[in-house]
């Protein structure tokens, strides 16, 4: 019965990037202008997405598919199919909701997004540290203080407590 | 439709004042967060300010501390930015923006935005 509907349903035959218009006794429409319709049969056309402000134009919408957006420069993608555009901050910062924050000592973020991480604590897999970390940098561990030869040392400074960065209050 | 509309952009000499005004359609402005943003000549885009639903919470980027306040005005679903004392450098293309659902718990996202306004400061 279904097919049997479809075969009669002269819908069925507007293909993409067309409409079937009620108006006109169900002739197949083209699209109007800045908008789309991405499979057949389809009684309406969808609104094209606009990218405009903090988004930008990545691909154009046409008849059969939607725009897609990308964000302006200085700015990333966020969710599916970029719906969302975010701020970046330099390394060594984290985004917060006053602005592009320097990560707190001990911390570090080597992204241009994301939220700053404590360094890593080298005594907890009995190491030392071999490089101090910085803001945009993690440590560097080296071997264990039991595999140094004599009258070295190495101080493993703990990684500080901390509220995530990220966090808006 | 979900939209934003800037305006109040001109030319200003340096010193002088400008108040820019965004109207929202197609939505409740008081549930979101909202931001301006600008992108000078040749420049990245750059967060400028934002204030949460009620007006409670308002930051600022440093270079416009002390100059520039964001206000809004939820009955008439209108984001305002007063901006005094205005610099060359202030000279941008100003967007408002929208905080998209979960700003400041989980992202900073901003997901409408305007077609912008121009400030020029010049003498």
């Known amino acids: 019965f279904e097919r049997t509907r479809s075969l009669q349903d002269p819908c069925s035959n507007c293909p993409a990037g067309t409409f079937c218009d009620n108006n006109r006794n169900q002739i197949c429409s083209p699209c109007p202008p800045n908008s789309f319709s991405s499979a057949g049969g389809q009684r309406t056309c969808d609104i094209c997405r606009q990218c405009k402000g903090v988004f930008r134009t990545r691909k154009e919408c046409s008849s059969t598919s939607n725009a897609e957006c990308d964000c302006t420069p200085g700015f990333h993608c966020l969710g599916a199919g970029c719906s969302m555009c975010e701020q970046d901050c330099k390394q060594g910062q984290e985004l917060t909701k006053k602005g592009c924050k320097d990560c707190c000592f001990g911390t570090f973020n080597d992204q241009k997004r994301g939220i700053c991480r404590p360094w890593t604590n080298c005594s907890l897999d009995g190491k030392s540290v071999l490089v101090n970390g910085t803001k945009e940098r993690d440590v560097v561990c080296g071997p264990s203080p039991a595999d140094l030869s004599p009258g070295a040392s190495s101080v493993t400074p703990p990684a500080p407590a901390r509220e995530p960065g990220h966090s808006p209050q | 439709e979900v939209q934003l509309v800037e305006s109040g952009g001109g030319l200003v000499q340096p010193g002088g004042s400008l108040r820019l005004s965004c109207a929202a359609t197609?939505?409740?402005?008081?549930n979101y967060w909202m931001n301006w943003v600008r992108q000078a000549p040749g420049k990245g885009l750059e967060w400028?300010?934002?204030?949460?639903?009620?007006?409670?919470?308002?930051y600022y980027v440093d270079s416009v501390k002390g100059r520039f306040t964001i206000s809004r005005d939820n009955a008439k679903n209108s984001l305002y930015l007063q901006m005094n004392s205005l610099r060359a450098e202030d000279t941008a293309v100003y967007y408002c923006?929208?905080?998209?659902?979960?700003?400041?718990?989980?992202?900073?996202?901003?997901?409408?935005s305007g077609q912008g306004t121009t400030v020029t400061v010049s003498s």
């Open positions: 400028v300010a934002n204030i949460n639903q009620d007006g409670s919470e308002r």
């Open positions: 923006a929208r905080g998209g659902e979960g700003y400041g718990v989980d992202h900073y996202g901003l997901d409408v």
């Open positions: 197609g939505f409740t402005l008081s």
